[in-house]
Amino acid sequence: FERTRSLQDPCSNCPAGTFCDNNRNQICSPCPPNSFSSAGGQRTCDICRQCKGVFRTRKECSSTSNAECDCTPGFHCLGAGCSMCEQDCKQGQELTKKGCKDCCFGTFNDQKRGICRPWTNCSLDGKSVLVNGTKERDVVCGPSPADLSPGASSVTPPAPAREPGHSPQ
């Protein structure tokens, strides 16, 4: 079938990086600058993506592949193929409609993107809080007091449940 198709359609012989030029008797012509064809047998080349404004070029457009964009410092990619750039926030913050806001008590964000997430509730796993949580870091859970044999550890038991480091009940 492939052989038959090739005989019938000369365009099928045009490799990626070219297009089948009807104006030149269906000869395979190279994609012009700022265009590409990622598959063979194409009758047109696609226009290359332009990485402008908040986008910056990660990789140039070649004859066979589109340009790849990234975001300028202070922004990060969202969506397939970095279709959008979203403003970075500091650790301990999340992006809202009004800009970057600190994480509420009992939540944290250890990245420059994404939302604030609740601290881990150590007691749900029968554990105790080893290190208190902050806006930037989750709590660190340790073994439950019952697991500690006398003299096995010098870890001080956590303060009452209202102290930072516990998720709201």
Partner: antibody, heavy 118, light 112 residues
Framework: EVQLVESGGGLVQPGGSLRLSCAAS????????MIWVRQAPGKGLEYIGF???????YYASSAKGRFTISRDNSKNTLYLQMNSLRAEDTAVYYC????????????WGQGTLVTVSS | DVVMTQSPSSVSASVGDRVTITCQAS??????LAWYQQKPGKAPKLLIY???TLASGVPSRFSGSGSGTDFTLTISSLQPEDFATYYC??????????????FGGGTKVEIK
Amino acid sequence: EVQLVESGGGLVQPGGSLRLSCAASGFTINSYHMIWVRQAPGKGLEYIGFINDGGFTYYASSAKGRFTISRDNSKNTLYLQMNSLRAEDTAVYYCARGVDGTSYPDLWGQGTLVTVSS
Amino acid sequence: DVVMTQSPSSVSASVGDRVTITCQASQSIGSDLAWYQQKPGKAPKLLIYRASTLASGVPSRFSGSGSGTDFTLTISSLQPEDFATYYCQSIYYGSDDVIYHTFGGGTKVEIK
């Protein structure tokens, strides 16, 4: 006038380091792919690598690890840091600007000679 | 690596001759190929890129063609200033930010 002027070449001992500079005038380097190419005496051209308009660097496999390309936008200057130099690194080093958003060099400097010898 | 094989390595020709230089890539590079001219003691000059696009200021007697692995530079009517060495160059991206932007070995066009 649109031009590139390389400097920093000279004699260096094997194992030594050298930093080449390429001063651009008439255009801003952070809007282009900026490229380093070298040519050993009497030999052909060898592509070293480039820094693109987004600030990302790419290197030929032979240059990766020993050579580092950087730029100073405020000085409109391109750099090539070369470490652990060997006799076979002796060459004329050219900086160049890419054409039309690509890494094909179209505007070239005059070149600077680096000689690695004891 | 992408290996670019240029032929012939040298050619003797006269003014007015039609000269053809070929370049073969070890793997398909689409139409990501350029041609350069270099004269002794001078920096190279870009003639053609994207296999067939004439660079700014380059005379129309220079033309490029080909795609995939096989490419050709043609000088339709050789002029005295065309005696020089010609190089092809691929653009090809590998993985881990490594590039195979490889030059061919060169073709020296000499006076017959």
